[in-house]
């Protein structure tokens, strides 16, 4: 892209190059032949995050507790507020405008990845040799009990939802 008539951090208006306002400030009046661009800081609840010629600052995002949101990072004059979800909830979308409860992994499934404020629980089916008999947002698939190490034998085979049942070995005399 070839260079334009005005330099970086300038804008072209009415045949003159005016300085853009720095992040955190809004445009009050364009420069003239005799005066510089006039900018004013954004108020406490507002921000602008780029070099700009905006006449209004943007409102900080509101983290609505009724939607399960809380402030992760307070906004400044140059940055927007960052919201995250309350414990046990995660964002519904990338913009995180509201939160939903974490998914629980049903029996037969274990937690592969625990949910965060921005991502839901990831479940995986319990492979052979592992089981989960609870609906949980935290529990991984657990290995079947090893009857042999307890000097016991398998009386009932395990499934993806149940542990094996161990019993005493038949002692034949």
């Amino acid at each position: 892209e070839p260079p334009t008539a005005c330099r970086e951090k300038q804008y072209l208006i009415n045949s003159q190059c005016c300085s853009l306002c720095q992040p955190g400030q809004k445009l009050v009046s364009d420069c003239t032949e005799f005066t510089e661009t006039e900018c004013l800081p954004c108020s406490e609840s507002e921000f602008l995050d780029t070099w700009n010629r905006e006449t209004r600052c943007h409102q900080h995002k509101y983290c609505d507790p009724n939607l399960g949101l809380r402030v992760q990072q307070k906004g400044t004059s140059e940055t927007d507020t960052i919201c995250t979800c309350e414990e046990g909830l995660h964002c519904m979308s990338e913009s995180c405008e509201s939160c939903v409860p974490h998914r629980s992994c049903l029996p037969g499934f274990g937690v592969k990845q625990i949910a965060t404020g921005v991502s839901d629980t990831i479940c995986e089916p319990c492979p052979v040799g592992f089981f989960s008999n609870v609906s949980s947002a935290f529990e991984k698939c657990r290995p079947w009990t090893s009857c042999e190490t307890k000097d016991l034998v398998v009386q009932q085979a395990g499934t993806n939802k149940t542990d094996v049942v161990c019993g005493p070995q038949d002692r034949q005399r």
Epitope: P2, P3, T4, A5, C6, R7, L12, I13, N14, S15, Q16, C17, T32, E33
Partner: antibody, heavy 116, light 107 residues
């Protein structure tokens, strides 16, 4: 006082190119943009483009940008407009003007006639 | 691109009259509107910039008003020297555009 002195009238053949000059005086040449405009006989004005003599950066009217080239020589305080692949539609008076809150000062115009 | 419409292409008035020329933009251009005078010999001068600011050396008989889309150039106490074509031009958004012009004649 601010003055913009343009080069003299040109008679050129279709398909060729023309280069119009605009010598500025009476102010700091690098501090103001130079605008170029076209006026066909008995018609209104049409903007061609703008150049920053300080940086050499420019903006063009999309309608003409493939054929127009704006340049500036700081050492002689002169701006140039070159127009290529000329047709009869390019027969017009071409003006340069100093920027700074509109086209604040204008050259006297250069008549370009495209004719076989 | 932004269109500028000068509805009156020619206007006849008497010396000493007050004359108003209008210019309408196809969209809001705030106050980025300039007025020019082109004499019969082709020379062009800036009269007002930013809708109402009188350019240096321009007689105070010339005044400008308007903002947004509707703009007016007023010449009070018309003089012989004011015989010319008057153009408006917007400096809000590239490409810069001009009105079609209003030719002022003496009755």
């Amino acid at each position: 006082q601010v003055q913009l002195q343009q080069s003299g009238a040109e008679l050129v053949r279709p398909g060729t190119s023309v280069k119009v000059s605009c010598k500025a005086s009476g102010y700091a040449f690098s501090d103001y943009l130079i605008e170029w405009a076209k006026q066909r006989p008995g018609q209104g004005l049409e903007w061609i483009g703008v150049i920053n003599p300080g940086s050499g950066g420019s903006n063009y009217n999309e309608k003409i940008k493939d054929r127009a080239t704006l340049t500036a020589d700081k050492s002689s305080s002169t701006a140039y407009m070159q127009l290529s692949s000329l047709t009869s539609e390019d027969s017009a008076v071409y003006f340069c003007a100093r920027g700074g809150g509109g086209f604040t000062y204008w050259g006297q115009g250069t008549l370009v006639t495209v004719s076989a | 691109e932004i269109q500028l419409t000068q509805t009156t292409s020619s206007l006849s008035a008497s010396l000493g009259d007050r004359v108003t020329i209008s210019c309408r933009a196809s969209q809001d251009i705030s106050n980025y509107l300039n007025w020019y005078q082109q004499k019969p010999d082709g020379t062009i001068k800036l009269l007002l910039n930013f809708a109402s600011r009188l350019h240096s050396g321009v007689p105070s008989r010339f005044s400008g008003s308007g903002s947004g889309t509707d703009f007016f150039l007023t010449i009070s106490n018309l003089e012989q020297d004011d015989i010319a074509t008057y153009f408006c031009q917007q400096g809000s958004t590239l490409p810069w555009t001009f009105g079609g012009g209003t030719k002022l004649e003496i009755k």
